[in-house]
């Protein structure tokens, strides 16, 4: 159905309230640095032109694209060429240019503090006295340090943060009830980020098709009594709503996104038996819900996969009528059966029965070629088998803390030319996948542990982008979506890396290190880690260990002191030099 | 059980457009596909299409895509074939068939239970 004007169409149906938190989160995402009140501003603007739209669609400029609509309203912006710089360059441009351009200037890594709240009583205060601005400062804090964030995932975790403060600023103990709840669900904001990053990674770089095959594996697993078509059904209307979330079409997707909520709802019979509950919330959590979902249970007579993709004798007739559908349905197959396999592996297996096909499909004797394509896949279901296997236990014995500074160590060996803060926080985030999955039981820890890999290297990968400095690193990144895991894991020490020159001030600690919060704490000590590793990055773990070991206590040592500034200044060049020895 | 009656197809240029229409009667269930082959004198079966009746998705084989279009009219119950584009190439005889939609080898004619009779389709240069 064509409508008249696009920006009536989206208001109506998304109602003013969402439609105008999507604002807020878009204009945030493309101008990360301006002012709330700013935003704010902006967005009231937008969203009383759409409501003057939806009354009288033929009213001036309501004709208009929302890309049009938007570009124009940023490029009022008055501090745009100070603040941005060459951003502002964009509007010179014409649509669809201008939107590729704001794009094109999103900034992964925009460096603005962690996000500190204030004291509850104060929170609670502001909750009560303006929710809406409330509400509009988190979506605003949270949508300009995560630019590529899940815009309708977002307009969900706002209502669960309103949530928490209704609840907790009626609690006797506000503290007590407010900590933990807004940890946890920074915890699945920060997931959530790093997850929808992954996935506008897939289709920026590796286009639709890599993102239909993870989407297929996915859902395939989640819904494995959907027939093919319905996932396919799923996969395509799902790859519309991400491909316009990731391109800053953020009514359009939230819009989209809760026409697959309602499609899957009315579909739940040839879908899911889980979905149910979901079915009955309302619109944010019933997408919400949908996404996250429980796995339903297998059909219980699946027939082997080697009938149709090895035994029947028209295999490569198949394959080359159709190539993207036969090979579609065998890892539509293949995922169903295989809950427990990370999507990764799953998109490994199918590549390599696809390169089989191509290369047994042009031999005499196809059959005999590809007769025993299933039983060569074992070293590829091996391989993460043993890395989780491996990484597991190493987990177990080490704690997280322990288990970061080993990634630490692997990885600022293998690519010791990336820069230290993305080093740290890269391995404290690989350091939680023990945390997160080894305590799963084994079904399901390959999964968890593997396709988390995957996120979490995509940070990496996202990082390096903006200033590259390691081949390695670029190789790794830009080969294969599929293979980056491995192709990290892969990585040997860097042969090739000239050792940093020593510099004493980067060793210089002060006694403001003793109040920093233990995860604080642990950065400092870890970002010494890496500095150390690049100054001598042949030191044995067992020298390193000693050296943490005496840093690790020359902190405790100085932090219990009375005089801790004098403390620090007095034995930190001491504790230099004695690693400088011990490291020779 | 399921009929199939087929209309359309003929004789046409290269280049030309041709649509083809396959109604179903009988007890149509749901969770079916209705699938499009062809066969040139002399080769095997070949799959050219299919459509889900439940939602619309298409699935084309690599020789046809781009070029022709799958429908469905439910109220009908017809699936249609729009050929676009035709080459000499695609001159067979076109078959409908009706099919479960849990199997998902959507490609191969031996997962379909009812067929249609076929109709010509004849493409000169």
């Known amino acids: 159905e064509a409508y008249k004007s696009e920006i009536a169409h989206r208001y109506n149906d998304l109602g003013e309230e969402h439609f105008r938190g999507l604002v807020l989160v878009a204009f945030s995402q493309y101008l990360q640095q301006c002012p709330f009140e700013d935003h704010v501003k902006l967005a009231k603007e937008v969203t009383e032109f759409a409501k003057a739209c939806a009354a009288e669609e033929s009213g001036a400029n309501c004709d208009k694209s929302l890309h049009t609509l938007f570009g124009d309203k940023l490029c009022t912006v008055a501090s745009l060429r100070d603040k941005y710089g060459d951003m502002a360059d964009c509007c010179e441009k014409q649509e669809p240019d201008r939107n590729e351009c704001f794009l094109a200037h999103k900034d992964d890594n925009p460096g603005f503090p962690p996000l500190v709240a204030p004291e509850p009583d104060a929170l609670c205060a502001a909750f009560q006295d303006n929710e809406q601005l409330f509400l509009g400062k988190y979506l605003y804090e949270i949508a300009r340090r995560h630019p590529y964030f899940y815009a309708p995932e977002l307009l969900y975790y706002a209502q669960q943060y309103k949530g928490v403060f209704a609840e907790c600023c009626q609690a006797a103990d506000k503290a007590a009830c407010l900590g933990p709840k807004i940890e946890a669900l920074r915890e699945k904001v920060l997931l959530s980020s790093a997850k929808e990053r992954f996935k506008c990674a897939s289709l920026q770089k590796f286009g639709d098709r890599a993102f239909k095959a993870w989407s297929v594996a996915r859902l395939s697993q989640r819904f494995p009594k959907a027939d093919f078509a319905e996932i396919s059904k799923v996969v395509t209307d799902l790859t519309k709503v991400h491909k316009e979330c990731c391109h800053g079409d953020l009514l359009e997707c939230a819009d989209d996104r809760a026409d697959l909520a309602k499609y899957m709802c009315e579909n739940q019979d040839s879908i899911s038996t889980k979905l149910k509950e979901c079915c009955d919330k309302p619109v944010l959590e019933k997408s919400q819900c949908l996404a996250e979902v429980e796995r339903d249970e297998l059909p219980g007579d699946l027939p082997s996969l080697a009938a149709d993709f090895v035994e029947d004798k028209e295999v490569c007739k198949n394959y080359q009528e159709a190539k993207d559908v036969f090979l579609g349905t065998f890892l539509y197959e293949y995922a169903r059966r295989h809950p427990e396999y990370s999507v990764s592996l799953l998109l490994r297996l199918a590549k390599e029965y696809e390169a089989t096909l191509e290369k047994c499909c042009a031999t005499d004797d196809p059959p005999t070629c590809y007769a025993k394509v299933l039983d060569e896949f074992k070293p590829l279901v091996d391989e993460p088998q043993n890395l989780v296997k491996t990484n597991c236990e190493l987990f177990e014995k080490l704690g997280e803390y322990g288990f970061q500074n080993a990634l630490l160590v692997r990885y600022t060996k293998k690519a010791p030319q990336v820069s230290t803060p993305t080093l740290v926080e890269v391995s404290r985030k690989l350091g939680k996948v023990g945390t997160k999955c080894c305590k799963k039981p084994e079904s399901e820890r390959m999964s968890c542990a593997e396709d988390f890999l995957s996120v979490v290297l995509n940070r990496l990968c996202v990082l390096h982008e903006k200033t590259p400095v390691s081949e390695r690193v670029t190789k790794c990144c830009s080969e294969s979506l599929v293979n980056r895991r491995p192709c990290f894991s892969g990585l040997e020490v860097d042969e090739t890396y000239v050792p940093k020159e020593f510099n004493a001030e980067t060793f210089t600690f002060h006694a403001d290190l003793c109040t920093l919060p233990e995860a604080e704490k642990q950065v400092k000590k870890q970002t010494a880690l890496v500095e150390l590793l690049k100054h001598k990055p042949k030191a044995t773990d067992e020298q390193l260990k000693t050296v943490m070991g005496d840093f690790g206590a020359f902190v405790e040592k100085c932090c219990a002191a009375e005089n801790k500034e004098g403390c620090f200044s007095e034995e930190g060049p001491k504790l230099v030099a004695a690693a400088q020895a011990a490291l020779v | 059980q399921v009929q199939l009656q087929q209309s359309g197809g003929g004789l046409v240029q290269a280049g030309g457009s041709l649509r083809l229409s396959c109604a179903a009667s009988?007890?149509?269930?749901?969770?079916?596909?209705m699938g499009w082959f062809r066969q040139a004198p002399g080769k095997d079966r070949e799959f050219v299409g299919v459509i889900s009746w439940d939602n619309g998705v298409t699935f084309y084989s690599d020789s046809v895509k781009g070029r022709f279009t799958m429908s469905r009219e439910i109220a009908k119950k017809t699936v249609h074939l729009q050929m676009n584009s035709l080459k000499p190439e695609d001159t067979a005889v076109y078959y409908c068939?009706?099919?479960?939609?849990?199997?998902?080898?959507?490609?191969?004619?031996?997962?379909?239970?009812?067929w249609g009779p076929g109709t010509q389709v004849t493409v000169s240069s």
């Open positions: 009988g007890r149509f269930f749901s969770r079916q596909v």
């Open positions: 068939a009706a099919g479960n939609a849990l199997h998902s080898r959507y490609y191969s004619p031996s997962k379909y239970d009812y």
